[in-house]
């Protein structure tokens, strides 16, 4: 039918960027590229009905169902969902196509179902049917990749037993240290499961699916590098595969490599060697030690020896269960308003942890960095000098860990005052927690120097706002001070602030700010 418009239906998946820090909350979403829903004319239906492919959405995900209409003239539209009409506002894109969108924020069970879009154009009327279901994410898994030797080949296969099936990539780097960061130009990524080039400096395999990304580094001892001050340590759980690569470069081929476990040569079938000439004609040899499924007795010192290099060792520790080792005692910090400061947690963990920093019910991304001594560190610097309670939470498959921090910002008190018919109260959040004085202003004491001691009740830290303490002082009204101006002052080691209150009749009182440093 030539009168029918050309229409395209797409699904746009939005990544909820809740953890974004300092971004405008009016646009918290990052969109993925649209997926075609292949709108097709529904056969044997009365009227013109297009049907989009059904869509499956994760709980709490945000999506847009969008229709692009290539038809002349204006269009009007109406969305219908569960017999309710929903507002529809078409607009035109740069190619002058009509665009109609339905945004579903934070998908819930109640938002699943059939969405009908009725479109009226100058030429014709038609209906588009969308079906939206909730995806069963309970079945999702993302497992850390592991290595296997390829049968009859000198190559490694990277395996991640995850659902949905992950995209597996090798991340290779031939530089040292910092230049091997993920975004560095020295890093090469290969989206394949099998790797033949095993001579690189740094070799990692990563697997990613809807749940995120997990990586495993090929543990390497480089005999041409100065050994670390502390012995490198590798943790594995019973049943996991062990892979250690020993690498050495020499001016010619006249050298050999061997592996020993606790001074005993590894059995045949637990190692394989590869060698190549580098661009400057030096010989590179690598010798892999591997155990397909480790047991407790595979624990020990693995030593790689060379006839031309000093030998180096690594301690392999086989554990029954994963762990997170760190001190969980809470820590309090007191800093100045403009002082640079980061919280940090030093921990040893296996398998690698997933972690978050939380403040004021908001979660922030957590970065970890490996240290030379086998420990890792996570730092959080983005506190923006907000006092309160900060929480570090880490977990892996077998263990959980939580550590609390309190941040106090040294500052002069700021005073807020309020009054009722029977009392006046002043509040301050300065730190260190302030002390209070009340003074009466009268003809005898125009500078408000007459101190009030009767009827004063101080409460330190009466209100805890996400770990931020607030101090208050209340003055009970007596006949002696009714009708007078009184002044409450909060002072600490950084200064004093005062607020003046007129004690006359009930209701809100005007405050006269009067700061004295």
């Amino acid at each position: 039918n030539q009168d029918l418009p050309v229409i395209k239906c797409v699904l746009i998946n939005h990544k909820n960027n809740d953890s974004s820090v300092g971004k405008s909350s009016s646009y918290p979403m990052v969109s993925e590229s649209p997926e075609d829903l292949g709108c097709a004319l529904r056969p044997q239906s009365s009227g013109t009905v297009y049907e989009a492919a059904a869509v499956e959405v994760d709980v709490s995900a945000s999506i847009t169902l969008q229709v692009l209409v290539d038809a002349p003239g204006n269009i009007s539209c109406l969305w219908v969902f569960k017999h309710s009409s929903l507002n529809c506002q078409p607009h035109f894109d740069l190619q002058n196509r009509g665009v109609v969108s339905m945004v579903i924020l934070k998908m819930t069970e109640t938002q699943a179902g059939e969405y009908l879009l009725f479109i009226q154009s100058e030429a014709t009327n038609y209906t588009i049917l969308f079906t939206v279901s909730i995806r069963n994410t309970l079945l999702y898994t993302l497992r850390r990749p592991y290595f296997r030797k390829m049968e009859n080949q000198d190559a490694l296969v990277c395996i991640s037993e995850s659902v949905p099936e992950p995209i597996v990539e090798w991340v290779l780097c031939d530089s040292q240290g910092e230049s091997c960061k993920e975004e560095s130009p020295a890093v090469v990524k290969k989206e394949e499961k099998v790797l033949h080039e095993l001579f690189g400096t740094d070799i990692r395999c990563c697997a990613r699916n809807e749940l995120g990304r997990e990586c495993t580094r090929l543990f390497t001892i480089d005999l041409n590098q100065t050994p670390q001050t502390t012995l490198p340590q590798l943790f594995l759980k019973v049943g996991e595969p062990l892979w250690i690569r020993c690498k050495a470069v020499h001016v010619n081929h006249g050298f050999g490599l061997t592996w020993e476990l606790e001074n005993k040569a590894l059995e045949e079938g637990n190692y394989f060697e590869m060698s190549t000439y580098s661009t400057n004609r030096t010989m590179i040899r690598i010798l892999f030690a591997f155990v397909s499924s480790v047991a407790r007795n595979d624990t020990g010192y693995y030593t790689c020896s060379s006839s031309k290099h000093p030998s180096q060792s690594a301690l392999v520790t086989i554990v029954e269960k994963g762990f997170i080792n760190a001190t969980n005692s809470s820590e309090d910090y007191e800093i100045d308003q403009y002082e640079e400061f980061c919280f940090s947690v030093r921990f040893k963990a296996y398998p690698q942890i997933r972690c978050t920093w939380t403040f004021s019910r908001k979660s922030f991304p957590c970065e970890q960095k490996g240290l030379d001594n086998g420990y890792s560190i996570s730092k959080f610097c983005n506190h923006k000098h907000q006092p309160g309670e900060y929480i570090f939470h880490a977990e892996n498959d077998d263990a959980q860990f939580t550590k609390m921090f309190t941040l106090n910002i040294r500052r002069k008190p700021q005073v807020l005052a309020e009054a009722s018919a029977s009392q006046a109260s002043c509040f301050s959040d300065g730190y260190p927690l302030p002390s209070w004085t009340w003074k009466k202003c009268s003809d005898k004491s125009p500078n408000c120097t007459e101190e009030i001691t009767e009827g004063v009740w101080n409460r330190k830290a009466n209100r805890k706002v996400f770990g931020q303490w607030v101090s208050s002082s209340t003055l009970n009204m007596s006949e002696a001070i009714k009708g007078f101006l009184v002044k409450c002052c909060a002072y600490n080691s950084l200064g004093t602030s005062c607020e003046t209150i007129l004690l006359n009749s009930p209701g809100p009182f005007p405050f006269i700010q009067d700061n004295i440093s």
Epitope: L11, A53, A54, E56, R135, E165
Partner: nanobody, 125 residues
Framework: EVQLLESGGGLVQPGGSLTLSCAAS????????LGWFRQAPGKEREFVAA????????YYADSVKGRFTISRDNSKNTLYLQMNSLRAEDTAVYYC??????????????????WGQGTLVTVSS
């Protein structure tokens, strides 16, 4: 790249039953939403049934609802279509189909990325 191979078609009497199978090879089966389509002689290919990648959700054409059941066994890399109470109008070549996304279910032909070669089902007395 995914290869799909259907089997189980044949001649069956009206009211009878038949089970179609679709074996997949190539990239792991569990990543795909899968479906069955059919094409009767002289007609366009039409949607019959679909199943999400996890097997959690199923979708059927109105004409087969209550009679056909789609299922999958990810451990065997196989998709099934159990057809009961077959009618003459179910006669067609049945195609196994896979999509390229875990979010979009193969309920319309344009989203199909991979097709099987088809298996003929004839319902006749």
């Amino acid at each position: 790249e995914v290869q799909l191979l259907e089997s189980g078609g044949g001649l069956v009497q009206p009211g009878g039953s038949l089970t179609l199978s679709c074996a997949a090879s190539g990239r792991t089966f569990s990543s795909y939403a899968l479906g069955w389509f059919r094409q009767a002689p002289g007609k366009e290919r039409e949607f019959v049934a679909a199943i999400s990648w996890s097997g959690g959700n199923t979708y059927y054409a109105d004409s087969v609802k209550g009679r056909f059941t789609i299922s999958r066994d990810n451990s065997k890399n196989t998709l099934y279509l159990q057809m009961n109470s077959l009618r003459a109008e179910d006669t067609a070549v049945y195609y196994c189909a896979a999509g390229g996304s875990t979010r979009v279910v193969v309920t319309t032909t344009p989203v199909v990325k991979y097709w099987g070669q088809g298996t003929l089902v004839t319902v006749s007395s």
